[in-house]
C-alpha cells in the first residue's frame, strides 16, 4: 500500500511516457491520474517499468475500477496482466477474442498459469460454449488445452468446433474425455468419404464403440498400432480375429510386439487359440 502524498510541483503526468520510469513509487501514486492511465494503457508496455512500479499502476486501476476493469482496459494490459490474481480476473467480463489473444500472447511460451486458466474459464463461460474460433485460439497457445477440460466441460463443445482440433491436441486426453469428443467428431466428419473420414476421425477413436470399429474394419483403413493401442478395452474385446486383421491390415504384424500390453493382451486372452493361429504371429491366448 502506497501512502497518499501530494504530487511535487511540475511532476503531474500529462501523458504516460518514458519519463515516468524515473518516478519513485510514491510519485507514481501521487502524480499519475488513474483515468489517464486507463485511457493510455496501450503505452505502458512500451515503457520499461520495474515490477514495483507496475504494482503501483495496478493499484491505481484497482482503485478506479473496484468492480473489475472494463474490456477497453483489459485488452491493453499487456505485461500488467502478469500482476493480476485469479480473484482480480474473476471480476472481469471478457467477450472479445482479440482481448483473449492479447492476454494469452503475454503468457506465451509458459505453462498455463492460474491467471490464464481463470481468464479462459471466464471467457468460455461468457460465450456459453467453446466455439471453433475460441478453440482454434486456445489450442494454438496451449496444445494440451482440450485435454485439461473435464468431460462435463467438453460436453459444451459443439461438433462444428471439432474441425479446429489437431491430433496433437488430443495427446494427453484420457478415455473419459475421448468418450465425450468421439461422438462429436463422428457428427462433424459424417459427410466425408471413407479414407478422408478415417484420417480425420483417427485421433478421436479412443472413444469409439465396438460397432464403429467393426464398420471401419470393412473399409480397408489400415489402422496403425499406436491408434489401436488407444482404443477402449470394452470396444476391442468383442472384435473377432478376422475383424482385427481387417482393421489393422498390414499393421497386424505389430500385434506381436504389443502382446504383453493392454488392450492387446486383454483381447488375445479372450480369443480362441485356433483363431489366433490363423494370424501366424505366434500369439498365445
Amino acid at each position: 500500500e502506497v501512502e497518499k502524498t501530494a504530487c511535487p510541483s511540475g511532476k503531474k503526468a500529462r501523458e504516460i511516457d518514458e519519463s515516468l520510469i524515473f518516478y519513485k513509487k510514491w510519485e507514481l501514486e501521487a502524480c499519475v491520474d488513474a483515468a489517464l492511465l486507463a485511457t493510455q494503457m496501450d503505452r505502458v508496455n512500451a515503457i520499461p517499468f520495474t515490477y514495483e512500479q507496475l504494482d503501483v499502476l495496478k493499484h491505481k486501476l484497482d482503485e478506479l475500477y473496484p468492480q473489475g476493469y472494463p474490456e477497453s482496459v483489459i485488452q491493453h494490459l499487456g505485461y500488467l496482466f502478469l500482476k493480476m490474481s485469479p480473484e482480480d480476473i474473476r471480476k472481469w467480463n471478457v467477450t472479445s477474442l482479440e482481448t483473449l489473444k492479447a492476454l494469452l500472447e503475454v503468457n506465451k511460451g509458459h505453462e498455463m498459469s492460474p491467471q490464464v486458466a481463470t481468464l479462459i474459464d471466464r471467457f468460455v463461460k461468457g460465450r456459453g460454449q467453446l466455439d471453433k474460433d475460441t478453440l482454434d485460439t486456445l489450442t494454438a497457445f496451449y496444445p494440451g488445452y482440450l485435454c485439461s477440460l473435464s468431460p462435463e466441460e467438453l460436453s459444451s463443445v459443439p461438433p462444428s468446433s471439432i474441425w479446429a482440433v489437431r491430433p496433437q491436441d488430443l495427446d494427453t486426453c484420457d478415455p473419459r474425455q475421448l468418450d465425450v469428443l468421439y461422438p462429436k467428431a463422428r457428427l462433424a466428419f459424417q459427410n466425408m468419404n471413407g479414407s478422408e473420414y478415417f484420417v480425420k476421425i483417427q485421433s478421436f477413436l479412443g472413444g469409439a464403440p465396438t460397432e464403429d470399429l467393426k464398420a471401419l474394419s470393412q473399409q480397408n483403413v489400415s489402422m496403425d498400432l499406436a491408434t489401436f493401442m488407444k482404443l477402449r478395452t470394452d470396444a476391442v474385446l468383442p472384435l473377432t480375429v478376422a475383424e482385427v486383421q481387417k482393421l489393422l491390415g498390414p499393421h497386424v504384424e505389430g500385434l506381436k510386439a504389443e502382446e504383453r500390453h493392454r488392450p492387446v493382451r486383454d483381447w488375445i486372452l479372450r480369443q480362441r487359440q485356433d483363431d489366433l493361429d490363423t494370424l501366424g504371429l505366434g500369439l498365445q491366448g
Epitope: P175, R176, T233, L237, H261, R262
Partner: antibody
Framework: QVQLQESGPGLVKPSETLSLTCTVS??????????WSWIRQPPGKGLEWIGY???????NYNPSLKSRVTISVDTSKNQFSLKLSSVTAADTAVYYC???????????WGQGTMVTVSS | DIQMTQSPSSLSASVGDRVTITCRAS??????LNWYQQKPGKAPKLLIY???SLQSGVPSRFSGSGSGTDFTLTISSLQPEDFATYYC?????????FGGGTKVEIK
Amino acid sequence: QVQLQESGPGLVKPSETLSLTCTVSGGSVSSYYSTWSWIRQPPGKGLEWIGYIYYSGSTNYNPSLKSRVTISVDTSKNQFSLKLSSVTAADTAVYYCARDNVFTGFDIWGQGTMVTVSS
Amino acid sequence: DIQMTQSPSSLSASVGDRVTITCRASQSISSYLNWYQQKPGKAPKLLIYAASSLQSGVPSRFSGSGSGTDFTLTISSLQPEDFATYYCQQSYDASYTFGGGTKVEIK
C-alpha cells in the same frame, strides 16, 4: 456380491511347496471380464503381484517368480489355486487372492492369509 | 519390468489438509494406472482406476490424474479415516507392478 476367501496352511517348511486355494462366492470364476490374481505382502513391506489366471486356463506370472509358480483354476468348484515351490524365509508374507476386472483393476480382494516359512 | 516409483514414501498431515501423492512409471503406461488404500491388517481397497476414474463407493475427495509416465493421487480434504498407506499399480504391461507405497500419518 462377489467375495473371495483364501485357505491353506499357515506354516510351510523351507524347500517345500506352499499351496493356497481361493474360493469365489457370489459370482463365477468363469467371468468373461475377470482374471484372478495372487498378490503377496511380506511383513512391513509393499505389495508384490505373483500372477493371474483366466478361466480358460491361460496364465501370466511375475518373471521373478515364474520358475517356482503354478496357478490353476477349477471352474466346477469355482476356485483357483497357487503353488509356490522351493520356499524360503523370504516367501513369508500375507497372501491375497484378488479379482482383476479388465476395466477397473483389483476391485475385490480376499482378506488375506499369513503364511510363514519356517522349520 | 516397469518400475513404479512413488513419492513421498511417507508424509505427515492434518485433518482438512490437501494431500498429493505422485507415482512415476519407468516407461509410458498410457492411462493404465490404479490407486489403492490399505489400512493395517486389512486388504487393499481400490480407489481410482484408469488413472482418473473414481471406483464406486469411494468419496469424491479422492481424485487421480495423469497419463504416460506421471500420475497423481489427490485427497482434497484429509479425513480421519484416510490415514493409511497408498499404493499405485500399473496394469499396462502383463507383469503388473506396484509402487513402494506412501504412508499418510497424522501430524
